[in-house]
Every structure is written in structure tokens, then in C-alpha cells.
């Protein structure tokens, strides 16, 4: 099923000359699983463990993790083993670290807030800069001011309205009455002044099976940058797409199973069936990544009767670009992610 988390094995190769004799084995074969899968708390994913054996409740942010007890992929978590050198056996579930931003030649760290000038407050979140205005532009005065004009006032950052009366003497405007209109005006002005920004979606966090993709958007009531996420599945892990490449072809850019299917997520099933397309593979040193895609809303129904919906990447076409990097480096693609309009001869 297209969105089922792919069984993940974590193979951490220790650095040379390090003692790994004390590294415990968390996987046992043959598999020994309880007769029925566990019931996970609301919001915690039911996934296959890292041994590819049993269903387990995914480890959450701050929980310990091992090659068997894996972190929740739907929450963009990974197992950070850095605190367990040289064994690399028990880690802690951590959020995938976001990348920094560069604006006007200045580098900002992920999560850092800054003011590029006196008119805007900006935040760097995962490579995207979201800004909110510090100058609220109230409506220009009406009726009583025939020639309103915005002027810069020395010592003040934000421009202000002035009214040029018949004597051509500018005077600072003031509203004639203070009622509900002003509050509405403030809200509308806030929205008019909000520089709407939505970053591109990040590459999928996994090269096969279920992953997460994120973006930053300030298109909300507060005009504040928020992270949105969607589920993504670039290709199934259990299908060898190489065998499907036609004779004489170097790539199969898109793989589409013939049968439609229901998506499953954390034990819940999509309320309708889909026939998704996946990105394929190449015989040469090229990677196929989504080129034409959109985000769809998928509704899920759970065995306990509860339902929820998730945003999901829907692939229409894939672009096989010129080089493959480490498929586990989810940020590598950000450097040269193909823009729809830039792929040319």
C-alpha cells in the first residue's frame, strides 16, 4: 500500500578502530511478535519495527531509539546516535535539523529571528525566510481628507498618512470617530501588509517508502511563518523498478501499478482508493525525482472509528536528473532541486 511505512533497517557503520564488541543486538531472528499489534496513543504511528519483524508504536521526540525501536517517520524524526559513541547502539529521537537561510548575503541559522530592516521581522525556518511587517498600514483617511498622502517622517521608520488640505498645508490625519471600523481596519491592513510567502516543498525525507516533506508558509490569520507537512512516497521499497525498464531505454521515469489501492497510515485506511504514480529509476547515474506534482488531501478511517485527513504528495511526472547523491541525505537535493521552469536543453 502506497503510504504504508516501509520497513527500515538502520545500518550504522562505526568509524575505523572503534570497539564495537559491546554493541548489543536488538533484533532477533526468527522474528518473535506478540499475537496482536499494540494499540498506539492518539497521534502515534503504528509502524513496522527496524528489524522488519513486528508492528510497534513509533518512538517519539526525546524517546530512546535503537535499530529495532525506530523513530516516528511521520513526524520527521530520526535516531540521533551521537551521544552513544563508539557503540552507536542507543540513540534519541530528534527532529531533522533544518537548514539555515541566506538573505542579502547574510547567513541566518535555522530558527533564528532577525530584522533585515526596521519594517520587517523575519524568521529562518528550514531554509525559508518568512517575514511579517512591523508597520501596520491603516486605511487612508476618507471623506474629510480629499488628498491623503503617505510620507516618511524623520526619526520614524514607518510612513504615515498626511492630509493635504486646500491650503496645501500637510496635517497629520486622525480618524473622525473611533468605533468598530478601526479594529476592522487594523485587521485588514495587517493582511494587506502581510507579504504572503510559501516556500517550495522540501525533498521527501526518504528515497523509498513513506516519508515527510515540509514547507514554510505565512498564509494564515497571524501572517506568521508556520511549517506545513505532507506525506510522500517517491517509490515503493519492495518493487525492483529496474526490471521494468523497456529494452533500449535508460530510465523508467514513472512507475504506476496497474491496480488501484487504498493508502494505509498508522493502521488507518484511506476512505477511497487511488492509483498513484511513483518515480522510477535509471540504469545510469541519474535519480528520478518529482517534476510535476501536487498536494492532495487524503481522508483516513481508523479501526476505532476515528478519522483524520493528511496532505499527501501526488506525483504526476518525474524528472530524471543528472546525478544521484546519498539517498539518505534529504537536504542534498535542495541545492539543485529542479524548478519546473528551469529544466531545459
Amino acid at each position: 500500500t502506497a503510504l504504508s511505512p516501509a520497513p527500515t533497517t538502520m545500518d550504522f557503520t562505526p568509524a575505523p578502530l572503534e570497539d564495537t564488541s559491546s554493541r548489543p543486538q536488538f533484533c532477533k531472528w526468527p522474528c518473535e511478535c506478540p499475537p496482536s499489534p499494540p494499540r498506539c496513543p492518539l497521534g502515534v504511528s503504528l509502524i513496522t519495527d527496524g528489524c522488519e519483524c513486528c508492528k510497534m508504536c513509533a518512538q517519539q521526540l526525546g524517546d530512546n531509539c535503537t535499530e529495532a525501536a525506530i523513530c516516528d517517520p511521520h513526524r520527521g524524526l530520526y535516531c540521533d546516535y551521537s551521544g552513544d559513541r563508539p557503540r552507536y547502539a542507543i540513540g534519541v529521537c530528534a527532529q531533522v535539523v533544518g537548514v539555515g537561510c541566506v538573505l542579502d548575503g547574510v547567513r541566518y541559522n535555522n530558527g533564528q529571528s532577525f530584522q533585515p530592516n526596521c519594517k520587517y521581522n523575519c524568521t529562518c525556518i528550514d531554509g525559508a525566510v518568512g517575514c511579517t511587517p512591523l508597520c501596520l498600514r491603516v486605511r487612508p483617511p476618507r471623506l474629510w481628507c480629499p488628498h491623503p498622502r503617505r510620507v516618511s517622517i524623520p526619526g520614524h521608520c514607518c510612513e504615515q498618512w498626511v492630509c493635504e488640505d486646500d491650503a496645501k498645508r500637510p496635517r497629520k490625519t486622525a480618524p473622525r470617530d473611533t468605533g468598530a471600523f478601526d479594529a476592522v481596519g487594523e485587521v485588514e491592513a495587517w493582511h494587506r501588509n502581510c507579504i504572503a510567502y510559501t516556500s517550495p516543498w522540501s525533498p521527501c525525507s526518504t528515497s523509498c517508502g513513506l516519508g515527510v516533506s515540509t514547507r514554510i508558509s505565512n498564509v494564515n490569520a497571524q501572517c506568521w511563518p508556520e511549517q506545513e507537512s505532507r506525506l510522500c512516497n517517491l517509490r515503493p521499497c519492495d518493487v525492483d523498478i529496474h526490471t521494468l525498464i523497456k529494452a533500449g531505454k535508460k530510465c523508467l521515469a514513472v512507475y504506476q501499478p496497474e491496480a488501484s489501492m487504498n493508502f494505509t497510515l498508522a493502521g488507518c485506511i484511506s476512505t477511497r482508493s487511488y492509483q498513484p504514480k511513483y518515480c522510477g529509476v535509471c540504469m545510469d547515474n541519474r535519480c528520478c525525482i518529482p517534476y510535476k506534482s501536487k498536494t492532495i488531501d487524503v481522508s483516513f478511517q481508523c479501526p476505532d472509528g476515528l478519522g483524520f485527513s493528511r496532505q499527501v504528495l501526488w506525483i504526476n511526472a518525474c524528472f530524471c536528473n543528472l546525478s544521484c547523491r546519498n539517498p539518505n541525505d534529504i537536504f542534498a537535493d535542495l541545492e539543485s532541486y529542479p524548478d519546473f521552469s528551469e529544466i531545459a536543453n
Epitope: 523497456k246 530510465c251 514513472v254 528520478c288 504526476n316 511526472a317 519546473f340
Partner: antibody, heavy 121, light 113 residues
């Protein structure tokens, strides 16, 4: 109903470049690709290039490789064809045409009205 | 010189049946790629007439039919009418070592006598 509206006729000097646009309505560039085909006066149809859904790349006819660039802008549902180093033989009507991004679907469903490009000395 | 060949012209009287052939090679039609047909009336853009060897888009009269066998295909028009006078092009997809190409036949001018 899908419609393709192309930019107006162009007269260009030999050696110059031309950029023809093709605006899509009734569908989006997320679901289909736009290819370019030209027709010299009194001659047949000649495919120039477009996105090959199964190869996962923009491909070009041998005759045009290195001289033509096809691009798509999904934000405006507009495609462009840029042809460089024009010669008199490039005088033709240039058509854009749609292909649905579906495996094995290699035909052109809808066509633009055509853009006449005349190359003069 | 087209990779796919068509006769330059065919003619027929109103009401008659005419066929237009389209011959390819092992890298296009013979490789299993479909053949499609387009009609181009004088002074207009081409229009899809037959797709996938024998399928008609909605609005195309059933007087037009297509077939494919081996490395060739043909378009048949029965009950010929004056408004059928146009250029007809076959088209396929060619996949060879040099790359992928959409290929057109050289076109056939149909004259209704």
C-alpha cells in the same frame, strides 16, 4: 475544453533568437506536457521537442539539439520555446501541442493556433 | 526525409473509400509504439483524428478508421466528402540508441475529385 493560445507572429533577423509562448487553459501543466512542432511553408510537420514522460527528461529532435530550449512555467500554465541562431530555413509556423502525462500516451490531443516566425536578412 | 513514410497524395470521388498508408521501422511502429493520425484543413492547425491505432476522439465521424500491423499502419476514409479534402499526417514514437523522438510521416494530401 483545453485551449492553447500562442503569442503573435514574429519577424527576426538571421542569427537572432525567437521565443514563442503558449498559454494553456482548461487544464494545468501539472497534468500534461507541451511539445513544439513546426511546419515550414508548403512542408510537413516536424517535431521539435518536449518533456518525455517515460524518459523523465526534456527531449529534442536531432535537428534542433543545442539550438532549442523548451520550458514550462506552472505558475502561469505557460510554455515557451526558445530557438537560437535563426536561419532562413527556420521560417515556419510553430505550433504547441499537449500530451497527457500518462504511460504510453504519445499523441498530441490539442494544438495551439500557430505562430508564424519569419526570418529575414 | 521522414523516418515514417506516407504517399504524397491520394484522391477519390465523393462517396468512395480511400486509404492512406504509413510505413515505419523496428524502432517505432515495429517496436510496438502506437500510430496516431491528424487532419490538417487548409490554413488551420492540425487536429487529432485517430489515436492509439484505431480510436476516434469524440466528434470524429465513424467514416474515419485506423489500423496497424507490424511496421505499418493505415487510415481509411469511407463515404468521402468534399470537406475531407485536407492533409493527413501519421505520427508515432521512436526509441533508438540516439534517443527518443516523436516522428511524423511526410503527410498525404487528399483531393476529393
Amino acid at each position: 475544453e483545453v485551449q492553447l493560445v500562442q503569442s503573435g507572429a514574429e519577424v527576426k533577423r538571421s542569427g537572432a533568437s525567437v521565443k514563442v509562448s503558449c498559454k494553456l487553459s482548461g487544464d494545468t501543466l501539472t497534468d500534461l506536457s507541451i511539445h513544439w512542432v513546426r511546419q515550414a511553408p508548403g512542408k510537413g510537420l516536424e517535431w521539435m521537442g518536449g518533456f518525455d514522460f517515460e524518459d523523465g527528461e526534456i527531449v529534442y529532435g536531432d535537428k534542433f539539439k543545442g539550438r532549442v530550449t523548451v520550458t514550462e512555467d506552472p505558475s502561469t500554465d505557460t510554455a515557451y520555446m526558445d530557438l537560437k541562431r535563426l536561419t532562413f530555413e527556420d521560417t515556419a509556423i510553430y505550433y504547441c501541442a499537449t500530451i497527457k502525462d500518462i504511460p504510453g500516451r504519445y499523441y498530441f490531443d490539442f494544438w495551439g493556433q500557430g505562430t508564424l516566425v519569419t526570418v529575414s536578412s | 526525409q521522414s523516418v515514417v513514410t506516407q504517399p504524397p497524395s491520394v484522391s477519390g470521388a465523393p462517396g468512395q473509400r480511400v486509404t492512406i498508408s504509413c510505413t515505419g521501422s523496428s524502432s517505432n511502429i515495429g517496436a510496438g509504439y502506437d500510430v496516431h493520425w491528424y487532419q490538417q484543413l487548409p490554413g488551420t492547425a492540425p487536429k487529432l483524428l485517430i489515436y492509439g491505432n484505431s480510436n476516434r476522439p469524440s466528434g470524429v465521424p465513424d467514416r474515419f478508421s485506423g489500423s496497424k500491423s507490424g511496421t505499418s499502419a493505415s487510415l481509411a476514409i469511407t463515404g468521402l466528402q468534399a470537406e475531407d479534402e485536407a492533409d493527413y499526417y501519421c505520427q508515432s514514437y521512436d526509441s533508438s540508441l540516439s534517443g527518443s523522438n516523436w516522428v511524423f510521416g511526410g503527410g498525404t494530401k487528399l483531393t476529393v475529385l
